[in-house]
């Protein structure tokens, strides 16, 4: 099969396009010439905001390491939003 496609059976009389993993899912196993993409749900702490046949789930940004705080929680489809810490006057 052509790049981006895989055999539908052992006989390989036909091919189908590799599937992509939807937002909220990441690639667990990249497709080969004889097997399709395997997707997995992004666990807590990880996200994917794209439909992709290659991208794994990405970890949420660590606001603390940037001396920032979480302004908006992350989801399985979105990263956290970091913001400046409120300073006491």
């Amino acid at each position: 099969c052509e790049e981006g496609w895989h055999c539908t059976s052992e006989a390989c009389e036909s091919c189908v396009l590799h599937r992509s993993c939807s937002p909220g899912f990441g690639v667990k196993q990249i497709a080969t010439g004889v097997s399709d993409t395997i997707c997995e749900p992004c666990p807590v702490g990880f996200f994917s905001n794209v439909s992709s046949a290659f991208e794994k789930c990405h970890p949420w940004t660590s606001c603390e390491t940037k001396d920032l705080v979480v302004q908006q929680a992350g989801t399985n489809k979105t990263d956290v939003v970091c913001g400046p810490q409120d300073r006491l006057r």
Epitope: G4, S9, E10, E13, V16, R19, S20
Partner: antibody, heavy 115, light 112 residues
Framework: EVQLQQSGPELVKPGASVKMSCKAS????????IHWVKQKPGQGLEWIGY????????NYNEKFKGKATLTSDKSSSTAYMELRSLTSEDSAIYYC????????WGQGTTLTVSS | DIVMTQAAPSVIVTPGESVSISCRSS???????????FYWFLQRPGQSPQLLIS???NLASGVPDRFSGSGSGTAFTLRISRVEAEDVGIYYC?????????FGAGTKVELK
């Protein structure tokens, strides 16, 4: 000669489910996927998804997830599509096709959803 | 989803003359493997769709050479020279590059 024979027309009530069939002949059933395509009256074509009879792997258009379920039966070389929670928007001709971009399509099953 | 746009809903043509039908995609259909996953289908009145042209310009088995396809990337054209009565129907373009596969709204060819 490759043929895809689809089941006859269906008249069903809103809220019900329906299961239509696509019987393949003239080739090795498990070696090709079966795609399903929707055509509303007087309108264009919409890809629903496919079923791979070799391993029962299915792939759906997000729009039809929860609406359509694709299955197959190797012993009878038949692919099936079940549609649930039917509304008037589901009234259409449904085609099965071997490989989609090949030349083999069924004759279509007309589904009418009406009370 | 990739949007396939067929600007002309219908065209009326005199038998024996030529007609061109256009289709645009919202994204390039050229894959990194060098192939362009673009197809033309014809649906004659009361019939199932049938493949006419694959990969922009390759005629399907049994399709007369009065049909030809051209284009690249996002813009494609189907040309029918010497139109005959059997060419009447709705012509659909389709992309096979990404899921979900998508079709154009169709261009109806009628005879004058």
């Amino acid at each position: 000669e490759v043929q895809l024979q689809q089941s006859g027309p269906e008249l069903v009530k809103p809220g019900a489910s329906v299961k239509m069939s696509c019987k393949a002949s003239g080739y090795t059933f498990i070696n090709y996927v079966i795609h399903w395509v929707k055509q509303k009256p007087g309108q264009g074509l919409e890809w629903i998804g496919y079923i791979n009879p070799y391993n029962d792997d299915s792939n759906y258009n997000e729009k039809f997830k929860g609406k359509a379920t694709l299955t197959s039966d190797k012993s009878s070389s038949t692919a099936y599509m079940e549609l649930r929670s039917l509304t008037s928007e589901d009234s259409a001709i449904y085609y099965c096709a071997r490989d989609l971009i090949g030349s083999y399509w069924g004759q279509g099953t007309t589904l009418t959803v009406s009370s | 989803d990739i949007v396939m746009t067929q600007a002309a809903p219908s065209v009326i043509v005199t038998p024996g003359e030529s007609v061109s039908i256009s289709c645009r995609s919202s994204k390039s259909l050229l894959h990194s493997n060098g192939n362009t996953y673009f197809y033309w289908f014809l649906q004659r009145p009361g019939q199932s769709p049938q493949l006419l042209i694959s990969r922009i310009s390759n005629l399907a088995s049994g399709v007369p050479d009065r049909f030809s396809g051209s284009g690249s990337g996002t813009a494609f054209t189907l040309r029918i020279s010497r139109v005959e009565a059997e060419d009447v129907g709705i012509y659909y373009c389709m992309q096979h590059l990404e899921y979900p596969f998508t079709f154009g709204a169709g261009t109806k060819v009628e005879l004058k």
